[in-house]
Interface confidence: low
């Protein structure tokens, strides 16, 4: 969670004179009750907007807005706390709005807005504004919660902001995988435009099973930006195990900004179509058995050999 | 091909609870959110909720805040709604659908009866 | 919310003919749009998404168009197969609503 930096927030307005501060989270007036305080905030809305920063990046934001109810305890208003709370890790950021001024009419009624919370994609947060003072111990709430879940990257404007497009949410690899002689495969793939290296696991399975009986990591250089958006071609070797024919690939980026955690894309080639009449298997071990060797990956030795070009 | 099978139909009383499943098939589970929607009889398309299967956030309906909850269980590539306290007027036709935002593919839909 | 509004609720055309459904938006919606065809007892459809991108395997004759409030599903040539319900829904914000519907009924 974090503040975008540009513009610097306002909280200002006609007939009241305002200014914005980061926050604790942990108001004076917790620890020093006050007698009098006001009451809480009004129709508290909640809406995803969207910013640059100084340098041009695009961010969902939290827009917070909310009213004053029309009472007299405007009188006590000091201030307001906004705190977010990111749900899944208990995150929690906060700002302060301090009031240089009173408010003393209703002439209109009281609005304000804050729009610098960053959020990030598929994550749920909970908007809270608490009037400031707070309350007295056993004394009325004065403040208003609600949820907030910002959309992932499917979403057509989330999928164009900074956190998206650096996850991947803009490559479309078109992979193809094409079956060749002596048992090799043929990955094809658009590179994206960032000198970033890429994976392909390549885990293969016997027909109708689940349990891999090959899997083979191929390791892509970051490409030259002259290779940006180019097709790249490797070619996978296979073991020539009894019955391991159905093969998936997958491929991984490592993009700057979300490293191990980018979306990988994956394209599956099925077994040949099987004979009415199968020839008898042989005895063997079962396929999917680990063997000794120094890969983190099983059988992933110099038979699930690589090679690869970039394609102009 | 991608398939989205849903529980079979249900008559409850007022105030039970019921569990609609959804079990996904031909792609990645985690990939794409899971959406429920119902219909009562004769009327439109209402909006229940979503389900991130990746990281299990969700975001429900106002009008059912309270009343609904919906998981997932990514080991069996199954999502699941439960509604409780259950009214007549929530007699429908409950769909799952794929995706968060836009429902590329649905259930074939699990008839819920309310009734005393 | 967002309130969806279809019309006209009933449509009634000859095959062969072209029909135009339309569907307004209480506030901007973007191009953040779906329509779906509905027939009795079966699930909807995806036709359209993006306001005017057609669903995989769906036939050229089923077109979209607009953006922000205002949005037209057209119906080139309508075949036999073609009555039924279509619903617009849009996914620019939550909660996600749909408009009420427009049955397409053989003339």
């Known amino acids: 969670l974090r503040l975008l930096d540009f513009p610097a927030p306002v909280c200002a307005q006609e007939g009241l004179s305002c200014r914005v501060k980061n926050s604790t989270c942990l108001d004076d007036s917790w620890i020093h009750p006050r007698n009098l305080t006001p009451s809480s905030p009004k129709d508290l809305q909640i809406q995803l907007h969207f910013a640059h920063t100084q340098q041009g990046d695009l961010f969902p934001v939290a827009h917070i807005e909310w009213t004053l109810q029309t009472d007299a305890s405007i009188l006590y208003l000091e201030g307001a706390e906004l705190s977010v709370l990111q749900l899944n890790t208990n995150e929690r950021l906060c700002v302060r709005f301090e009031f240089l001024s009173k408010l003393r009419h209703h002439h209109r009624r009281w609005r304000f807005t804050f729009s610098h919370f960053v959020v990030d994609p598929d994550q749920e947060y909970e908007v809270t504004v608490h009037h400031l003072p707070k309350p007295i111990p056993d004394g009325d709430p004065n403040h208003q919660s609600k949820n907030f879940l910002v959309p992932d990257c499917e979403h057509a404007r989330m999928k164009v902001t900074t956190p998206c497009m650096s996850s991947g949410s803009l490559w479309d690899p078109n992979i193809t995988v094409e079956t060749l002689e002596a048992h090799q495969l043929r990955v094809s793939f658009t590179l994206w435009n960032e000198s970033t290296h890429y994976q392909i696991l390549l885990t293969s399975f016997p027909h109708m099973e689940n349990h891999s009986c090959f899997e083979h990591m191929h390791h892509i250089p970051a490409p030259r930006p002259e290779e940006f958006h180019q097709r790249s071609n490797v070619t996978l070797t296979l073991r020539n195990l009894k019955g391991c024919c159905r093969h998936q690939v997958q491929i991984q980026p490592f993009f700057s900004s979300c490293l191990n955690d980018c979306l990988r894309h994956s394209a599956t080639v099925s077994c040949p179509e099987m004979p009415d009449t199968p020839e008898p298997i042989p005895d063997y071990m079962p396929l999917w058995e680990p063997r000794s060797g120094s890969s983190d990956y099983k059988d992933d030795d110099d038979k699930g050999s690589s090679h690869h070009h970039h394609h102009h | 091909q991608v398939q989205l099978v849903q529980s079979g139909a249900e008559v409850k009383k007022p105030g039970a609870s019921v569990k609609v499943s959804c079990k996904a098939s031909?792609?990645?589970?985690?990939?794409?959110?899971i959406s429920w929607v119902r219909q009562a009889p004769g009327q439109g398309l209402e909006w229940m909720g979503w389900i991130s299967t990746y990281s299990g956030n969700t975001n429900y309906a106002q009008k059912l805040q309270g009343r609904v909850t919906m998981t997932t269980d990514t080991s069996t590539s199954t999502a699941y709604m439960e509604l409780r306290s259950l009214r007549s007027d929530d007699t429908a036709v409950y769909y799952c659908?794929?995706?968060?935002?836009?429902?590329?593919?649905w259930g074939q839909g699990t008839l819920v009866t309310v009734s005393s | 919310e967002i309130v969806m509004t279809q019309s006209p609720a009933t449509l009634s055309v000859s095959p062969g003919e072209r029909a135009t459904l339309s569907c307004r938006a209480s506030q901007s919606v973007s191009s953040n749009l779906a329509w779906f065809q509905q027939k009795p007892g079966q699930a909807p459809r995806p036709l359209i998404y993006?306001?005017?991108t057609r669903a995989t395997g769906v036939p050229a004759r089923f077109s979209g168009s607009g953006s922000g409030t205002d949005f037209t599903l057209t119906i080139s040539s309508l075949q036999s197969e073609d009555f039924a319900v279509y619903y617009c829904?849009?996914?620019?914000?939550?909660?996600?609503?749909f408009g009420g519907g427009t049955k397409v009924e053989i003339k």
């Open positions: 031909g792609y990645t589970f985690t990939r794409y959110g």
């Open positions: 993006d306001a005017s």
């Open positions: 659908a794929r995706r968060q935002l836009y429902f590329d593919y």
């Open positions: 829904q849009q996914y620019d914000n939550w909660p996600l609503t």
